[in-house]
């Protein structure tokens, strides 16, 4: 099924996708829609590059935050609330009868956690929890780390968006 | 709400062009994609093609060399042409659109004899 | 092309019983999959698209699961106007294709 990212209400989210540009500088068309990638296009589009720019978006809490010019499309959605959660497709709209790369991810947005952060997580989240963690303004900040991710349980994961408050991050679920 | 109608004939002669309309209420053929659809007397269904927004097309490969479709925005239609038909192409044949073909015509049954 | 291999061609079943429709691709499909509902005289009526999601104003009988190449379409609590043909369509590719259909009858 989709990926799951975990943000908190108020804090940004970051949703990844990246295509490679092929030759270099070759942009092609991106959408990013509310819900799963259709048949054609997306539904319900939220932002729209063309070959040269971003030339569509519904609201000014959408962005591309990445080098967009590389084939980095990930979706930044500032200022989350309870209805931002859901899946949303990233296309790729590469030309040809099969070339479109489809990407569903899934947001869910949680209430602010009302948890003292555990003084044992005041550390590097990114190492603590590699392929887990992604912020909004940096890109993701995921580790080629080998092994299976550590059993996180919701009261770790409502102490983890505690910590990242500030920076906006948003946790990623496998 | 979309609202799609087929027309054109209903009996064809073998190595003849079939043309059909699709007429569109409701939404404009400047926006989105706008679908062919045809469902053989056996219960089979063939996607044939589109044409889109910004007037683009793509065509099912099995079709590529007899057919074409086409638009008129100031009428908000669109056509399918289908040249050098067989017994082969009788089906009925529907108009459709939507992010998952939501939006169907309701059909028009071509038979294709002599 | 990738085939949508639909079972069973056809199927029988009582008001307010349950029946499953299956569809496997000849591929993995990604859970692009659709299922429609065919009536004589109208055009096919979207259910449910990505496998699962039942289209607005479709009942909660109706149900879809299913990933990689195996998917399946159930309805629970049949009603007399449930009878028709179902067919499955995959979307993971401009190469649409349809599965062979499904006529559901009353027993």
């Known amino acids: 099924s989709e990926v799951e990212y975990i943000a908190e209400v108020g804090q940004n989210a970051y949703l990844p996708c990246s295509y490679t540009p092929a030759p270099p500088g070759n942009l092609v068309p991106v959408c990013w829609g509310k819900g799963a990638c259709p048949v054609f296009d997306c539904s319900n589009v939220v932002l729209r590059t063309d070959n040269r720019d971003v030339n569509d978006r519904t609201s000014g809490r959408y962005w591309l935050k990445g080098d967009f010019h590389k084939g980095d499309v990930s979706l930044t959605i500032e200022n989350v609330t309870l209805a931002d959660s859901g899946v949303y497709c990233c296309r790729i709209q590469i030309p040809g009868i099969m070339n479109d790369e489809k990407h569903n991810v899934k947001l869910v947005v949680i209430k602010p956690a009302k948890v003292t952060p555990a003084p044992t997580l005041q550390r590097d989240l990114t190492s603590a929890f590699p392929r887990m963690l992604t912020t909004g303004e940096h890109g993701p900040a995921e580790t080629q780390t080998p092994g299976s991710l550590p059993d996180v349980n919701l009261t770790q994961i409502f102490t983890l968006t505690n910590e990242l408050r500030d920076s906006g991050a948003t946790i990623r679920t496998a | 709400e979309v609202q799609l109608q087929e027309s054109g004939p209903s009996l064809v002669k073998p190595s003849q062009t079939l043309s059909l309309t699709c007429s569109v209420t409701g939404d404009s053929i400047t926006s989105g994609y706008w679908n062919w659809i045809r469902k053989f007397p056996g219960n089979k269904l063939e996607y044939m093609g589109y044409?889109?927004?910004?007037?683009?097309?793509y065509y099912n490969p099995s079709l590529k060399s007899r057919i074409s479709i086409t638009r008129d925005t100031s009428k908000n239609q669109y056509y399918l042409q289908l040249n050098s038909v067989t017994t082969e192409d009788t089906a009925t044949y529907y108009c459709?659109?939507?992010?998952?073909?939501?939006?169907w015509g309701q059909g028009t049954t071509l038979t294709v004899s002599s | 092309d990738i085939q949508m291999t639909q079972s069973p061609s056809s199927l029988s079943a009582s008001l307010g019983g349950k029946v499953t429709i299956t569809c496997k691709a000849s591929?993995?499909?990604?859970?692009?999959i659709a299922w429609y509902q065919h009536k004589p005289g109208k055009g096919p009526r979207l259910l449910i698209h990505y496998t699962s999601t039942l289209q607005p104003g479709i009942p909660s009988r109706f149900s879809g699961s299913g990933s990689g190449t195996d998917y399946s379409f159930s309805i629970s609590n049949l009603e007399p106007e449930d009878f028709a043909t179902y067919y499955c369509l995959q979307y993971d590719n401009l190469l649409f294709t349809f599965g062979s259909g499904t006529k559901l009858e009353i027993k």
């Open positions: 591929q993995d499909i990604n859970k692009y």
């Open positions: 459709a659109t939507g992010n998952h073909f939501d939006y």
């Open positions: 044409i889109n927004y910004s007037g683009s097309t």
